[in-house]
Interface confidence: low
């Protein structure tokens, strides 16, 4: 089953997904796309990174994070009740089938006509810019809250730098628990 | 065409902070890194640190317990704190750009601080 | 921290010569982020290559970068008389970013 994340129009969505690279440098190819991971590849591709650099992307779609420390994560600008669906990310590592795929479902919400000032915020609002590092040290393994059991020792960033980050006060605020170590 | 431009006292007493902005224009501070490199008189070039504009920081390990550097996105500008400074921290300052990938490919002209009493 | 160790310090060279300078790194560099740089006297630095062997825009074709691993070359086939600079090699993959020492290219 897909992880669910939710944006009002007009907002940026924030769509998760991590590696980590075996050392500095040492990027593995990763592909986004609309709607469902296939058997390979992925369909409806919007974003592509190589070993070295992203060498494919579209309006609206961009990693704002440090895709050189395993964060792919996809940021969608300005979205619109179209941008709702499936998205897979897909890492790419060398072999036979030995891809990890992540289908992630994203809602997209009807603008509120009058936003009434809250400090309760969805999960893709606590995330509205995750922790970019260039990330260089022992990674960690984190657990996000609304996270499934899913391995995330492949999805990790660096704990020791969330500590004090603008993103775990972000999931404080949000009520969303992140667990270190 | 993106620039990059260094401003802040020139001199600084020992034991004070030294602050300085850079302020970025002809084209947003979105989307990259902002770093702040260091050159004493007649050395070579010493990393200081960089932010991302989301505020995730990355410091040199060993000015880390002195430096902070924050950025203003509403502004186009990132600063540099570096506190209680004595003269070995008299250098030139330049802020530059880094993409990433493509390393430091803007960089400010550079503005002289001499740590003097 | 990786260590960058530059030679020669000094190279004393004529217009026209062809100038090849070393960088060593003292644990493997990621060639993707090994990058030199051009500094004149009271100038800012200018970035030259990025990915060990990628010309920067704007930087002529005499500049070219080589190497992997802990070996890095930039070489500069054909020196003009602008050319004579102090250079720097930096590796941007792991935490902290280090330049290496630099070397100074001067008119024989």
């Known amino acids: 089953s897909e992880v669910e994340y939710r944006a009002e129009v007009g907002q940026n969505a924030y769509l998760p997904c991590f590696y980590t690279p075996a050392a500095p440098g040492n990027l593995v190819p990763v592909c986004w796309g609309k709607g469902a991971c296939p058997v390979f590849e992925c369909g409806n591709v919007v974003l592509r990174t190589d070993e070295r650099d992203v060498n494919y992307w579209t309006s609206r779609y961009w990693l704002n994070g440090d895709f050189r420390k395993g964060d792919v994560s996809l940021t969608i600008e300005n979205v619109t009740l179209a941008d709702s669906g499936i998205y897979c990310c897909r890492i790419q590592i060398p072999g036979i089938m030995n891809d990890e795929k992540f289908n992630l479902k994203l809602v997209i919400k009807p603008a509120k006509v009058t936003p009434a000032p809250t400090r309760q915020r969805d999960f893709t609002a606590a995330f509205p810019r995750m922790l970019t590092t260039r990330g260089h040290g022992p990674a960690e393994t984190q657990t996000l809250g609304s996270l499934p059991d899913i391995n995330l020792t492949q999805i990790s960033t660096l704990a020791n730098e969330l500590r004090d980050s603008r993103l775990a006060n972000d999931l404080r605020d949000s009520g969303a628990t992140i667990r270190i170590g | 065409q993106v620039q990059l431009q260094e401003s802040g006292p020139g001199l600084v007493k020992p034991s004070e902070t030294l602050s300085l902005t850079c302020t970025v224009s002809g084209g947003s501070i979105s989307r990259h890194y902002w770093n702040w490199i260091r050159q004493p008189p007649g050395k070579g070039l010493e990393w200081i640190g960089y932010i991302h504009y989301s505020g995730s920081t990355n410091y040199n390990s060993s000015l880390k317990s002195r430096v902070t550097i924050s950025v203003d996105t509403s502004k186009n500008q990132f600063s540099l704190k570096l506190s209680s400074v004595t003269a070995a921290d008299t250098a030139v300052y330049y802020c530059?750009?880094?993409?990433?990938?493509?390393?430091?490919?803007?960089w400010g002209q550079g503005t002289t601080v001499t740590v003097s009493s | 921290e990786i260590v960058l160790t530059q030679s020669p310090g000094t190279l004393s060279l004529s217009p026209g010569e062809r100038a090849t300078l070393s960088c060593r790194a003292s644990q493997s560099v990621s060639s993707s982020y090994l990058a030199w740089y051009q500094q004149k006297p009271g100038q800012a630095p200018r970035l030259l290559i990025y990915g060990a062997s990628s010309r920067a825009t704007g930087i002529p074709d005499r500049f070219s970068g080589s190497g992997s691993g802990t070996d890095f070359t930039l070489t500069i086939s054909r020196l003009e008389p602008e050319d004579f600079a102090v250079y720097y090699c930096?590796?941007?993959?792991?935490?902290?970013?280090?330049f290496g020492g630099g070397t100074k290219v001067e008119i024989k």
């Open positions: 530059a750009r880094d993409t990433g990938y493509y390393g430091m490919d803007i």
């Open positions: 930096q590796q941007y993959g792991s935490s902290p970013l280090t």
